[in-house]
């Protein structure tokens, strides 16, 4: 299914990194959650992969095609 890479987008609801202390800006939901279709405005967000929307974070995330890495699946994985 390729590599799953979290997007740096946070939509101002949750922090960009799991280790960031962001209690003041987090929502009342947990980090884990299911996915939904990405909003249409993110159609071209993932370059070499498919977009999915993290429901609890309201953020786009990319599932990279094999051999690609990066938040937007924009880099070739040299170790692939």
């Amino acid at each position: 299914d390729g590599n799953s890479t979290r997007s740096p987008e946070t939509n101002g609801l949750l922090c960009g990194d799991p280790d960031e202390n962001c209690a003041a800006t987090t929502t009342q939901s947990k980090r884990k959650g299911h996915f939904s279709r990405c909003p249409k405005q993110y159609k071209h967000y993932c370059i070499k992969g498919r977009c999915r929307f993290v429901v609890t974070e309201q953020t786009p995330s990319c599932v990279c095609d094999e051999g690609y890495i990066g938040a937007r699946c924009e880099r070739v994985d040299l170790f692939y």
């Epitope: 740096p8 987008e9 939509n11 609801l13 960009g16 962001c22 800006t25 909003p39």
Partner: antibody
Framework: QVQLLESGGGLVQPGGSLRLSCAAS????????ISWVRQAPGKGLEWVSY????????NYADSVKGRFTISRDNSKNTLYLQMNSLRAEDTAVYYC?????????WGQGTLVTVSS | DIQMTQSPSSLSASVGDRVTITCRAS??????LGWYQQKPGKAPKLLIY???SLQSGVPSRFSGSGSGTDFTLTISSLQPEDFATYYC????????FGQGTKVEIK
């Protein structure tokens, strides 16, 4: 605490240019998408543009496409909006807001007036 | 472009009243909808995201519902500080706001 402080607004003639800045503090700027949203006097809100955390994914409202350019300098925790070919209908308070789709923190806004 | 239509454009209510504002999208946006409150001379404040999720720090008297094209913001018991203008915003296609609903004191 999270703070966004816009600057650079003022009076400009139609066809002129202006560059707005938004200085961010109180959060890790480089990890967040940021947007510009404007509000004409006595009118509603209009999203203008957003830029992702690295500056590689950008979108604009049709009303400003080709005239406005959004950019950011993560080393300076600053967002910019270069506005060219300004029109009377661009007159508004311009807010920078944290987020790309939803906006949980906003600046106080800077007024741009386009008039001859 | 997706158009967002709010109704009513203004309403008068009293403290303690239950207030309902509706927002209709010109095409389906699933649940990609937020609600904001704005007071005169101030920046907007995010109240609700994903149509029905309460933003952190927002009082529980605010609630949102709906999906597809029809959405509702409800204030269960209006408080003095709730007199303001409310905007819906879709974020499925490029972000667009409704025209606003002004809640005034009766």
């Amino acid at each position: 605490q999270v703070q966004l402080l816009e600057s650079g607004g003022g009076l400009v003639q139609p066809g002129g240019s202006l560059r707005l800045s938004c200085a961010a503090s109180g959060f890790t700027f480089s990890r967040y998408w940021i947007s510009w949203v404007r509000q004409a006097p006595g009118k509603g809100l209009e999203w203008v543009s957003y830029i992702d955390s690295t500056g590689t994914f950008i979108n604009y409202a049709d009303s400003v496409k080709g005239r406005f350019t959004i950019s950011r300098d993560n080393s300076k925790n600053t967002l910019y909006l270069q506005m060219n070919s300004l029109r009377a209908e661009d007159t508004a308070v311009y807010y920078c807001a944290r987020g790309g789709s939803l906006f949980d923190y906003w600046g106080q806004g800077t007024l741009v007036t386009v008039s001859s | 472009d997706i158009q967002m239509t709010q109704s009513p454009s203004s309403l008068s209510a009293s403290v303690g009243d239950r207030v309902t504002i509706t927002c209709r999208a010109s095409q389906g946006i699933i649940s990609y909808l937020g609600w904001y409150q704005q007071k005169p001379g101030k920046a907007p404040k995010l109240l609700i995201y994903a149509a029905s999720s309460l933003q952190s720090g927002v009082p529980s008297r605010f609630s949102g519902s709906g999906s597809g094209t029809d959405f509702t913001l409800t204030i269960s018991s209006l408080q003095p500080e709730d007199f303001a203008t409310y905007y819906c915003q879709q974020y499925d296609a490029l972000n667009t706001f409704g025209q606003g609903t002004k809640v005034e004191i009766k």
